[in-house]
């Protein structure tokens, strides 16, 4: 199937490319630049994934969460690990599968039923045919009790990016994740210099926008490591 | 059937720039990845760029890093391709690809089950 499509020689602690990078002579796929295929078998099971090292829920699948491997592991290693489903523990929604969320500690179905607070509905509209998605998975999306198909606006609760309007970014705030604007030119932003560093967080900045990238600013060059600002700079 | 539609091609100098919009219908664009290919006269299709679902990592071939910038607005199910510091050998036609996104892992051309028609991208030296 095609989440199986995965690679069991992958370079540990490099996040995985996202495409194949300039194609072989005579190859139909693309593969990454120094990642070999096994011979002949395109297709491996997940059992062959290897741990991506993460800072966010967002950078893993979206089957997935951002996570230390072992309990009360060091909170500076964190990798994607696999989602929880229905009735297993849980800290915060985005450990729970899709079509789940975290309540009082356990993944419990998005039903709207149990969840009126911040309703989060199930939408099993698929990107290709109208009736399933791929493997019976549904999308989640949150979505505010006064406005049930818009996406959340800043300040709303939210469990990943995708549910918030556009402009906006989920982030944590406290010990919850809400709809936050993503960072314009200028504004200060946060690099994070090693991985997992985001979980240290509690007041998580969004990413920059588009064509924007989190640097150095050009008159802090000078400062100590640790005092340096960064901001978002046009490319 | 999914439905993916590349706009924002055309005829430019080397040294310009152009933007390329990927635009899906259906919901579940939040939840895919999505590259983008080219493929030059004669030459076979090459990766060019990806973005994850949730727009927080994304790769780039070493041709154009550094030139090409890839985003994503998820409330629109639109893609971008920004392309600056054009060159002739950037003359392609472009891709926009979506596939499922529910691991963080290493992907092919296999992983992209939708592709669009494609959008012809000329640069004159």
């Known amino acids: 199937t095609l989440n199986s499509v995965l690679n069991s020689n992958a370079i540990k602690n490099l996040p995985p490319p996202l495409g194949g990078a300039a194609g072989h002579p005579g190859s139909a796929v693309s593969a990454a630049p120094g990642i070999l295929y096994p011979g002949g078998n395109k297709y491996q099971t997940i059992d062959n994934y290897q741990p991506y090292p993460c800072a966010e829920d967002e950078e893993c699948g979206t089957d997935e969460y951002c996570a230390s491997p072992t309990r009360g592991g060091d909170a500076g290693v964190q990798i994607c690990l696999a989602c929880r489903k229905r009735r297993k523990r849980c800290m915060r929604h985005a450990m729970c599968c899709p079509g789940n969320y975290c309540k009082n500690g356990i993944c419990v179905s998005s039903d709207q039923n149990h969840f009126r607070g911040e309703i989060e509905e199930t939408i099993t509209e698929s990107f290709g045919n109208d009736h399933s998605t791929l493997d019976g998975y549904s999308r989640r999306t949150t979505l505010s009790s006064k406005m049930y198909h818009t996406k959340g606006q800043e300040g709303s609760v939210c469990l990943r990016s995708s549910d918030c309007a556009s402009g906006l970014c989920c982030a944590r705030h406290f010990w919850s994740k809400i709809c936050k604007p993503v960072l314009k030119e200028g504004q200060v932003c946060t690099k994070h210099r090693r991985k997992g560093s985001h979980g240290l967080e509690i007041f998580q900045r969004c990413y920059c926008g588009e064509g924007l990238s989190c640097r150095i600013q050009k008159d802090h060059h000078q400062a100590s490591n640790s005092s340096r600002l960064h901001t978002c700079q046009r490319h | 059937e999914v439905q993916l539609v590349e706009s924002g091609g055309g005829l430019v100098q080397a040294g310009d720039s152009l933007r390329l919009s990927c635009t899906a219908s259906?919901?579940?664009?939040?939840?895919?990845?999505v590259g983008w290919f080219r493929q030059a006269p004669g030459k076979e299709r090459e990766f060019v760029t990806a973005?994850?679902?949730?727009?927080?990592?994304?790769d780039y071939a070493d041709s154009v890093k550094g030139r090409f910038t890839i985003s994503r607005n998820n409330a629109e199910n639109t893609a971008y391709l920004q392309m600056n510091s054009l060159k002739f050998e950037d003359t392609a036609v472009y891709y926009c690809?979506?596939?499922?996104?529910?691991?963080?892992?290493?992907?092919?051309?296999?992983?992209?089950?939708?592709w669009g028609q494609g959008t012809q991208v000329t640069v004159s030296s």
């Open positions: 690809a979506a596939g499922w996104d529910r691991y963080a892992r290493v992907l092919t051309e296999y992983d992209y089950v939708w």
């Open positions: 259906g919901s579940a664009f939040s939840r895919s990845v």
């Open positions: 973005i994850n679902w949730s727009g927080a990592r994304t």
